[in-house]
């Protein structure tokens, strides 16, 4: 058993049929010694008396808020949560496996630049009685500070018969050094509590590996005289690291109709303009990627050919 | 060329060669994203490699103030990786695929280090650690980790030379 926060404790249980469970001793936070009784949750049934209560925790019915009283007055609470371990593996029932970029990916994180700011998100089908707490650091043995905000519900989607909820959190490295080569990864830890179930999820990454620039901005077209060709120009996204002579992007420019199966024109460039062939009912799209490190491409920025 | 006396390197040549290094480092090990090497005890095997750190003057302001600190750090790293790629980690079993770009990568590391430090001038170089894995599978894993680390190193070096070519070239 360990303390998650004040008056909230996590009991780690090997979860299998007829498991013996864990013996837990609760102590009432009071100077009183006599006349103390214990109850669980809203029940008035007295579970025991005395300053300590010994219980055998085997299942969720044994978890909950234990309260010690004296003469009708509440002295203190202890909330017990369960953390299940099945076949040596901690349960992952609360969050959905996003399976990208690999199986058992529960947390996904992205950064728009090298400033040390990043966003992580996760998915669940649970809508109520759900809380998250996020901590992060650079490195684990001698951790350096990363400050995370509160996790918030950022999107709801319908997937078949189920509703899916997306939560996200923003974090910022306290002393980021955008130009340096990272040697220690960022660690992100998410505590998830659903009713009386506790789970924790972790992710470890370098900022360079989660970079995904915003799409290029201010796409403009200029038809070339006596030609089917069009000069398309754009700018670096505002959120990208500066100076651009140091933090350079490379671009992919594509002309395509509405269907992916349609024919296309495609060219890669390090410049902020390119010449392509525009077709009726097609769109010109541009996306960006770090020029020197193959992290994710941005989403496309598009303008119609007409 | 960046000689210890402090004259400027051939920024544009260094830029071209460092960009080539980036391309080669990724073609030598393109599937890095599919293998989470940090799960394999990453810190004790590759924390000996020289990293370009915050105080090394490789940021745009540091380069403007005095690029020599940064160039020396990059030179150390290039020599270090060049030795690693020539060591039995890469030459031993399992043999590299005949079309592996590691040979080109090795030559390009040497080429860039020579651009930075001509014959007869010597910056101090970092000792190469004795990473001699006994098992072929350990060697394979170590190769992946070294190439992964090299990708990050040459990315920073390429940014330095691109910025230098754009803003510090005479």
């Amino acid at each position: 058993i360990w303390e998650l926060k004040k008056d909230v404790y996590v009991v780690e249980l090997d979860w299998y049929p007829d498991a013996p469970g864990e013996m837990v001793v609760l102590t009432c936070d009071t100077p009183e010694e006599d006349g103390i009784t214990w109850t669980l949750d809203q029940s008035s049934e007295v579970l025991g008396s005395g300053k300590t209560l010994t219980i055998q925790v085997k299942e969720f019915g044994d978890a909950g808020q234990y309260t010690c009283h004296k003469g009708g007055e509440v002295l203190s609470h202890s909330l017990l949560l369960l953390h299940k371990k099945e076949d040596g593996i901690w349960s992952t029932d609360i969050l959905k496996d996003q399976k990208e970029p690999k199986n058992k990916t529960f947390l996904r994180c992205e950064a728009k630049n090298y400033s040390g700011r990043f966003t992580c998100w996760w998915l669940t089908t649970i809508s109520t009685d759900l809380t998250f707490s996020v901590k992060s650091s650079r490195g684990s043995s001698d951790p350096q500070g990363v400050t995370c905000g509160a996790a918030t519900l950022s999107a709801e989607r319908v997937r078949g018969d189920n509703k899916e909820y997306e939560y996200s959190v923003e974090c910022q490295e306290d002393s980021a050094c955008p130009a340096a080569e990272e040697s220690l990864p960022i660690e992100v830890m998410v505590d998830a509590v659903h009713k009386l179930k506790y789970e924790n999820y972790t992710s470890s990454f370098f900022i360079r590996d989660i970079i995904k620039p915003d799409p290029p901005k201010n796409l403009q077209l200029k038809p070339l005289k006596n030609s089917r060709q069009v000069e398309v120009s754009w700018e670096y996204p505002d959120t990208w690291s500066t100076p651009h002579s140091y933090f350079s992007l490379t671009f992919c420019v594509q002309v395509q109709g509405k269907s992916k199966r349609e024919k296309k024109d495609r060219v890669f460039t390090d410049k902020t303009s390119a010449t392509v062939i525009c077709r009726k009912n097609a769109s010109i799209s541009v996306r960006a990627q770090d020029r020197y490190y193959s992290s994710s491409w941005s989403e496309w920025a598009s303008v119609p050919c007409s | 060329r960046a000689v210890p006396g402090g004259s400027s390197p051939a920024w544009t040549q260094c830029q071209q060669l460092s960009q080539k290094l980036c391309t080669l480092a990724w073609s030598a090990h393109p599937l890095v994203g599919h293998m989470d090497l940090r799960e394999e005890g990453d810190e004790e095997t590759t924390n000996d490699v020289p990293h370009i750190q915050c105080g090394d003057g490789c940021d745009p302001q540091g380069l403007r103030d005095n690029s020599q600190f940064c160039l020396q750090r990059i030179h150390q790293g290039l020599i270090f990786y060049e030795k690693l790629l020539g060591s039995d980690i890469f030459t031993g079993e399992p043999s590299l695929l005949p079309d592996s770009p590691v040979g080109q990568l090795h030559a390009s590391l040497l080429g860039l280090s020579q651009l930075l430090q001509p014959e007869g001038h010597h910056w101090e170089t970092q000792q190469i650690p004795s990473l001699s894995p006994s098992q072929p599978w350990q060697r394979l894993l170590l190769r992946f980790k070294i190439l992964r680390s090299l990708q990050a190193f040459v990315a920073v070096a390429a940014r330095v030379f691109a910025h230098g070519a754009a803003t510090l070239s005479p």
């Epitope: 089917r228 060709q229 490379t250 199966r261 349609e262 024919k263 296309k264 024109d265 495609r266 060219v267 890669f268 460039t269 390090d270 010449t275 062939i277 077709r279 009726k280 | 073609s27």
Partner: antibody
Framework: QVQLVQSGAEVEKPGASVKVSCKAS????????LHWVRQAPGQGLEWMGW????????EYAPKFQGGVTMTTDTSTSTAYMELRSLRSDDTAVYYC???????????WGQGTMVTVSS | EIVMTQSPATLSVSPGERATLSCRAS??????LHWYQQKPGQAPRLLIY???QSISGIPARFSGSGSGTEFTLTISSLQSEDFAVYYC?????????FGGGTKVEIK
């Protein structure tokens, strides 16, 4: 499968014109760009231009501007390349080539030998 | 127009050996570079597109690398059917242009 079949060899006199055909099969004709590339005997490849069979748009290499016309007939899935004012150095194998991507060539015809000789 | 230069013009290699073919552009073309193989009396065949992307059906012994102005086609272990002429082609800008070709012949 995607296939391009070209017309047979031609022998022309200097100053004449030649029209080479290229019949496409195995795909929807308007779904691919069509290019013409030529190769003089013992020489390398030279791009001449492209046509979009969907709308007839064309782009010619500057060298061939004014001397070449590329057309298509969607009813027969056939592309044509006409070269006018032939000279002896137009003697070459002329290839049609197609792709869904505009700037490189995925599928090639077998080539048509055009000999310009007096 | 962009001039593409291939070297060497002829490469003599023994079967089973590795062949490295070079292609240089007269200006930076990012990764807009494609490789073709042509055997005598036949049309060219696309091997690699956008510098390093492999084509299904093309043996894995063919690989491409490079960006900017310098590109390489590597044939890791030459088979008898690989003796041919190889062309690079840039697609950075029109007119599309080819290199002069490298003939890979039996040593």
């Amino acid at each position: 499968q995607v296939q391009l079949v070209q017309s047979g060899a031609e022998v022309e006199k200097p100053g004449a014109s030649v029209k080479v055909s290229c019949k496409a099969s195995g795909y929807t004709f308007t779904d691919y760009y069509l290019h013409w590339v030529r190769q003089a005997p013992g020489q390398g490849l030279e791009w001449m231009g492209w046509i979009d069979p969907e709308n007839g748009d064309t782009e010619y290499a500057p060298k061939f501007q004014g001397g070449v016309t590329m057309t298509t007939d969607t009813s027969t899935s056939t592309a044509y390349m006409e070269l006018r004012s032939l000279r002896s150095d137009d003697t070459a194998v002329y290839y049609c080539a197609a792709n869904k991507e505009l700037r490189y060539f995925d599928v090639w015809g077998q080539g048509t030998m055009v000999t310009v000789s007096s | 127009e962009i001039v593409m230069t291939q070297s060497p013009a002829t490469l003599s290699v023994s079967p089973g050996e590795r062949a490295t073919l070079s292609c240089r552009a007269s200006q930076s073309i990012s990764i807009n570079l494609h490789w073709y193989q042509q055997k005598p009396g036949q049309a060219p065949r696309l091997l690699i597109y956008f510098a390093s992307q492999s084509i299904s059906g093309i043996p894995a012994r063919f690989s491409g690398s490079g960006s900017g102005t310098e590109f390489t086609l590597t044939i890791s272990s030459l088979q008898s059917e690989d003796f041919a002429v190889y062309y690079c082609q840039q697609s950075n800008s029109f007119p599309l242009t080819f290199g002069g070709g490298t003939k890979v012949e039996i040593k």
